[in-house]
């Protein structure tokens, strides 16, 4: 309705004789701002005077008047949207309606707001979930309907009167919709909390009681129970009996129904709070429980071990490992089913009995083939001495031994020749099934155990054999000691360390890797002609004309090896050097000639130098000279000279005559 | 110091004679350590030799085939100068032409002094 | 006629770089292999003759080297002056041919 001031704030707020009020509070004048406000405590309207009537807690008005009581009360609002208010201390006559008359320029309202103030603090409200079973985390809310800036207060939990370890978390509210003042506490509760009282205690500041609320909880779970057997110590032998009962220490709702368990396997037809075992059996040893069940679930006691004691049983050997590998660790153990555990144990190989060895387990730390065969064992505790079982085997494996490589061949094997080898051995577990043979090649096994070498190599020096079952045992290699014509045979320059030049004296050495048997000869020879016998071969003055193809050749008692032919370089300067004249040393003025310095050189001339007949060197530096066109007075000797990186050489002069040609004649 | 001064017309008709002049100080002509030789340059031939005239025991001359038979070199004793002339010009022989100093003794013929050159334009 | 090849026709480089350029002969000239340095609008001027003898006057960052067919001028470190074209010459025989050039510009 448009013709009316809007205004917010909680309907009705509640305190306690000497604490406080803060009215949260927000509104709308119909038009401009608020020129005159007055709270009435229980105002009523006269009709007469066209005014309220009542007590007037505070006042403020144009003129600025207050009455005294405005210490106590205090509007903290303004004029156009604030009209919070605020009585500190408050008292119970405050209790009542309180009336907000306002008033701007042309319009009135008044407001009303109900208070409640009680002589005592009152107390605050517990709020429990419908439902708490245990273990599940619930939150209790404990909630007061109070709230003041000037008036600190503060809420605490308790379980049967002591302060609960859980923190709470608190929270106020002083907002138009609700003033409160709220504590929540996140709780786990368990069985036994079942029937115990939770306060919510409200304190001042100080920590001074004030008032409280309290609650009974109603913790739903799983029946809890308690397992008693007879005898106490759940130990009999074969044929005794045992009487197991089943007590219920608490449960919420009521129990439902009863079972009892062995091995976590339901018993049939046991359905009471007693269970009867008559003549036991070893097999009804186990772990016993009872379970009882209600609408939350079934509740489990405690596990009752149920041990039923017998003489042992026959005997099993388990062998760690078979079949086992010479040298190896084996252990042996004797498994009999016994209650007790067996005390005494003995062992048998091979239907002897193997003295000292009392134990469960016999370890032998290094097996060798002669503990290969049966073994079995007895156990023994109070009640008796069990029966013999059947035993275990042990097979003890190892290589083949004394493994030797045989040459069939007559001696001396020469290269190329045929060699057939076998490789033996003394005995194997398990059997041999293959041989290897070092080192590998394209060779023939005719048969297993046996090796054919066609061709025989050089270099094949010694052969070892291995047979192999699960393992290979190798043999000693033995030495073929192939004989062969000589290897590898190469001219090398001893001298000079450098490249060859004309003069130098020149050393070649035969060189070869090797010869067997030891004892050699040499040859040397150039373009098929035969120089020396020796290993070298020696030039006092090397000459140009020593350069060429060498070989030499090594020999012995199986045959003869030729080098590589070694190319033998003489390095030399510039020699025979001599002009040649193109067309010819006679040219006619006006024509071309072409000068050409030819020579013999080891390395190539790099450059040439040309010279005149008054010995000035002219401006060319490669092998042909061009004069064009030719002058009568380039008539003429000339001389060249060549040089290279092992010296400089000149050539003999070459005269060149230059004639008139007919125009020439004709002038003159 | 050596010098060379170039003299000569920067433009020449085609099909007329080009003249150029190479005055040396500091230098012989006819020094038997020397050569004198005549360079182009245009940007699309690079630099070209040309030729050159020296004197050893005689007067020699060497051209560049590309103007063999329409080039001439002479060397002029008595004025210490060398001159170029080459016949029948066309407008591919607008260059930039340098006379040069060859040095033949420890500099092995490298042109060690230039001349300032001369732009010449062939054109009608 | 005796082809020189110079690479590369080109480069970019800076103040302190080395450089290298590089000249190959179309047949052997033994050591008779000069390198010039030309700016514009001058003549060119003698750095390195005979392939690594330096020209008198010419500053000691210029070096040359080869011999036969493949020669190589270096700057080891690079001065503002030297941005210029470089060019190769051979004095072996005639007729005298130079290379195409290599001009080094500012990075």
């Known amino acids: 309705d448009s013709s009316k001031w809007v205004f917010e704030h909680p309907e009705t707020l509640y305190a306690w004789e000497g604490a406080c009020v803060w009215i949260p509070c927000t509104y709308r004048a119909l038009d401009g701002d608020l020129e005159s406000f007055i709270l009435f405590h229980n105002p009523e309207y006269n009709k007469n005077t066209s005014k309220f009537d009542g007590t007037r807690l505070y006042e403020s008005t144009k003129d600025g008047k207050v009455p005294s009581e405005q210490k106590r009360v205090q509007f903290l609002g303004d004029k156009n949207k604030n009209c919070t208010l605020s009585i500190h201390p408050v008292h119970l006559n405050d209790s009542g309606q309180l009336g907000l008359r306002m008033e701007s320029k042309t319009e009135k309202w008044m407001e009303r707001i109900h208070l409640n103030v009680s002589e005592r603090p009152f107390p605050p409200h517990i709020q429990l979930p419908p439902e708490i079973q245990e273990s599940q985390e619930v939150t209790l809310t404990c909630l007061l309907n109070f709230s003041c800036y000037g008036y600190p207060i503060q809420l605490q939990w308790l379980l049967e009167g002591v302060p609960m370890r859980q923190a709470a978390v608190t929270s106020t509210s002083l907002t138009i919709k609700s003033v409160f003042t709220r504590s929540e506490l996140k709780f786990s509760p368990q069985w036994s909390h079942h029937g115990k009282i939770v306060t919510c205690q409200l304190q001042d500041a100080d920590g001074k009681f004030l008032s409280n609320d309290t609650v009974q909880l109603n913790v739903k779970h799983t029946p809890k129970l308690e397992i008693k057997v007879t005898p106490s110590d759940a130990i009999v032998r074969e044929g005794d009996s045992v009487t197991m009962t089943c007590e219920v220490s608490s449960s919420n709702p009521e129990y439902t129904t009863v079972s009892w368990l062995k091995d976590g396997t339901s018993l049939k037809k046991q359905n009471t709070f007693t269970l009867n075992l008559r003549e036991v059996t070893k097999d009804q040893s186990g772990k016993y429980c009872c379970q009882v069940s209600n609408d939350v679930g079934p509740g489990r006691s405690e596990e009752v071990f149920l041990q039923v004691q017998y003489a042992p049983e026959p005997s099993t050997v388990q062998i760690l490992h078979s079949p086992a590998v010479e040298g190896s660790q084996v252990e042996f153990l004797c498994m009999s089913l016994a209650n007790p555990l067996p005390t005494n144990y003995t062992w048998y190989h091979n239907g002897k009995e193997m003295q000292g060895r009392t134990e469960e387990k016999v370890h032998i730390p290094k097996i060798l083939p002669w503990h290969a065969g049966t073994y079995s064992c007895v156990a023994e505790n109070i009640l008796g001495t069990g029966q013999r079982g059947p035993g275990a085997e042990l097979d003890v494996q190892y290589p083949p031994k004394k493994v030797t490589t045989v040459i069939q061949n007559p001696m001396p094997i020469r290269e190329g020749d045929t060699v057939t080898l076998s490789c033996n051995y003394n005995s194997s577990n398990p059997s041999v099934t293959r041989y290897e043979w070092k080192p590998h090649g394209a060779w023939e096994e005719p048969s297993l155990g046996v090796l054919k070498i066609q061709n025989v190599g050089w270099d094949n020096t010694t052969i070892a054999c291995a047979a192999c079952n699960s393992w290979c045992s190798w043999a000693s290699p033995v030495a073929l000691n192939v004989q062969y014509a000589p290897r590898d045979v190469r001219v090398r320059k001893i001298k000079p360390l450098s490249e060859i030049h004309s003069g130098n004296s020149v050393s070649l050495q035969c060189d070869f890797s090797s010869s067997h048997p030891k004892e050699v000869q040499f040859f040397w020879e150039k373009n098929g002609r035969l120089l020396g016998k020796e290993s070298q071969l020696n030039f006092d003055s090397i000459s140009p004309e020593d350069a060429g193809s060498y070989s030499c050749w090594v020999n012995n008692s199986i045959g003869q090896t030729a080098s590589k032919a070694w190319t033998l370089e003489v390095l030399y300067a510039p020699r025979r050097l001599r002009v040649s004249m193109s067309p010819g040393d006679q040219v006619m003025e006006g024509k071309s000639a072409t000068l050409t310095c030819e020579s013999d050189a080891n390395p190539p001339v790099s450059h040439y130098t040309w010279f005149d007949w008054n010995n000035q060197s002219l401006p060319y530096h490669s092998q042909k000279l061009r004069l064009e066109p030719v002058k009568v007075q380039h008539s003429g000797a000339y001389w060249c000279q060549g040089t290279n990186s092992v010296g400089k050489g000149r050539s003999p002069l070459s005269t060149l005559t230059v004639y008139y040609s007919p125009e020439t004649i004709g002038r003159r | 110091q050596v010098q060379l001064q170039q003299s000569g017309p920067g433009l020449v008709k085609p099909s007329q004679t080009l003249s150029l002049t190479c005055a040396i100080s500091g230098d012989s002509v006819s020094g038997n350590r020397a050569t004198w030789n005549w360079i182009r340059q245009s940007p699309s031939r690079g630099l070209e030799w040309l030729g050159r005239t020296y004197y050893r025991s005689a007067w020699y001359n060497d051209y560049a085939v590309s103007v063999k038979g329409r080039i001439t070199f002479n060397p002029d004793t008595s004025k210490n100068q060398f001159s170029l002339q080459l016949n029948s010009v066309t407008p591919e022989d607008t260059a930039v032409y340098y006379c040069?100093?060859?040095?033949?003794?420890?500099?092995?013929?490298?042109?060690?002094?230039w001349g300032q050159g001369t732009t010449v334009t062939v054109s009608g | 006629d005796i082809q020189l090849t110079q690479s590369p026709p080109s480069l970019s480089a800076s103040v302190g770089d080395r450089v290298t350029i590089t000249c190959r002969a179309s047949q052997s000239i033994s050591s008779y292999l000069n390198w010039y340095q030309q700016k514009p609008g001058k003549a060119p001027k003698l750095l390195i003759y005979a392939a690594s003898s330096l020209q008198s006057g010419v500053p000691s960052r210029f070096s040359g080297s080869g011999f036969g067919t493949d020669f190589t001028l270096t700057i080891s470190s690079l001065q503002p002056e030297d941005f210029a074209t470089y060019y190769c010459?051979?004095?072996?025989?005639?007729?005298?041919?130079f290379g195409q050039g290599t001009k080094v510009d500012i990075k």
């Open positions: 040069a100093r060859g040095e033949s003794g420890a500099a092995a013929d490298a042109f060690d002094i």
């Open positions: 010459q051979q004095s072996y025989s005639t007729p005298q041919t």
